[in-house]
Interface confidence: low
């Protein structure tokens, strides 16, 4: 996958869009993380609705949100009040079984606001962190669930 | 129905390379992920990788990523697997299999087999 | 890669009896989804394998309802409750939680 650009400007939103084949990914939730170096685990920031037919409807995890187009087959992903810190390699993902699927992979890069004079050395990029088998595999991370989400789905 | 037919029994020289088919039927070819799986003679099975016909997306087991390349031909609905640089290590039977999508929530499973083709890499 | 483990490599029944086959994996099988991706083939001789059970305990369509799957994390397990001469063979547990897909290396189920 080559990667996508996404400028926005610190303090305002971002949209990012990913476009997909809506035939292959049909019935997959779909999920925004945030990557960890080049070979490190993507770490997941915010997924689509637990209910599939209910993707459009937008979550939001902090000040990201995710909402998806599941017959155009388009994911959005919007970063209200882009700061410096939000800066780095994303993935959005499709929630494949029992993969995660690359959709796209995003550079998000913060501009600072001309009316903001802060030092641009606060531009923050991930280092490097370990190495991990495969980069397909969905990688956990413990969060607060958001109001109305089930921690896990039945389990088998 | 479903079916998956393989190509018929291979006599191979070592060193030569191999081409292997899986004609699908009965089923949205291009839409399924479509597995490729080792079998040697008294033995276990080996998972080789994965091929999504759709657009051509694949999946190798690392050890068969240099010899083995997976395609397919969404317009004979035929899935392909090509061996090269054979050794006595590679006879065995190949076996195509479709992966289950038990949609919305994929079981990744293999539903439907081939029935084998059968590959003997003798001088 | 994930290496299955399956015990016993040879099952000696008799026809009637309950049968009981184990599966182990190296790590966890609980994808970070939150579902197990455990799956269970019967290969009889000179054929290909054919899916019994997938996700640990969802028969599929046309398994009669003697087989049963079952376990968590690591460990699993296929019982056959009475065992008939149509299901002799061998049975391979196989895991697609991580790529690579692996399988175990197979039980062989025969007439005692």
């Known amino acids: 996958h080559n990667t996508t650009v996404f400028q926005g400007v610190a303090g305002q939103s971002l949209q990012v869009s990913c476009p997909y084949d809506s035939m292959k990914h049909w019935g997959r939730r779909k999920a925004w993380c945030r990557q960890l170096g080049e070979k490190g685990p993507c770490q997941r920031v915010v997924s689509t609705h637990n209910l599939w037919l209910l993707s459009f409807l937008r979550r939001w995890n902090g000040s990201t949100a995710i909402t998806d187009d599941t017959l155009g087959g388009t994911l959005t992903i919007t970063l209200r009040n882009l700061q410096p810190h939000d800066a780095g390699l994303y993935q959005c993902q499709s929630l494949a079984g029992s993969e995660a699927d690359t959709l796209r992979k995003v550079l998000v890069e913060v501009l600072a606001d001309p009316l903001d004079h802060r030092d641009a050395g606060d531009l923050w990029f991930p280092g490097e962190s370990e190495s991990f088998e495969d980069a397909h595999v969905e990688h956990s991370i413990s969060r607060s669930l958001l109001e109305g989400e089930i921690p896990f789905p039945p389990t088998s | 129905q479903v079916q998956l037919q393989q190509s018929g029994p291979e006599l191979v020289k070592p060193g030569a390379s191999l081409k292997i088919s899986c004609k699908a039927s009965?089923?949205?070819?291009?839409?399924?992920?479509m597995n490729w799986v080792k079998q040697r003679p008294g033995k276990g099975l080996e998972w080789i990788g994965r091929?999504?016909?759709?657009?051509?997306?694949?999946n190798y087991n690392g050890e068969f990523r240099v010899r083995a390349t997976l395609t397919a031909d969404t317009s004979s609905t035929t899935a392909y697997m090509q061996l090269s640089s054979l050794t006595s290590e590679d006879s065995a039977v190949y076996f195509c299999?479709?992966?289950?999508?038990?949609?919305?929530?994929?079981?990744?499973?293999?539903?439907?087999w081939g029935q084998g083709a059968s590959v003997t890499v003798s001088s | 890669d994930v290496v299955m483990t399956q015990t016993p490599l040879s099952l000696p029944v008799s026809l009637g009896d309950q049968a009981s086959i184990s599966c182990r994996s190296s790590?966890?099988?609980?994808?970070?989804?939150?579902?197990?991706?455990l799956h269970w083939y019967l290969q009889k001789p000179g054929q290909s394998p054919k899916l019994l059970i997938y996700?640990?305990?969802n028969r599929f369509s046309g398994v009669p309802d003697r087989f049963s799957g079952s376990g968590s994390g690591t460990d699993f397990t296929l019982k056959i409750s009475r065992v008939e001469a149509d299901d002799l063979g061998v049975y391979f547990c196989?895991?697609?939680?991580?790529?690579?897909?692996?399988f175990g290396g197979g039980t062989k189920l025969e007439i005692k």
């Open positions: 196989s895991q697609s939680t991580r790529v690579p897909y692996t």
């Open positions: 009965g089923y949205a070819f291009s839409s399924s992920w």
């Open positions: 790590q966890s099988l609980v994808h970070s989804n939150g579902y197990t991706y």
């Open positions: 996700k640990v305990s």
């Open positions: 091929i999504y016909p759709g657009d051509g997306d694949t």
């Open positions: 299999a479709r992966l289950l999508r038990n949609q919305p929530g994929e079981s990744y499973a293999m539903d439907y």
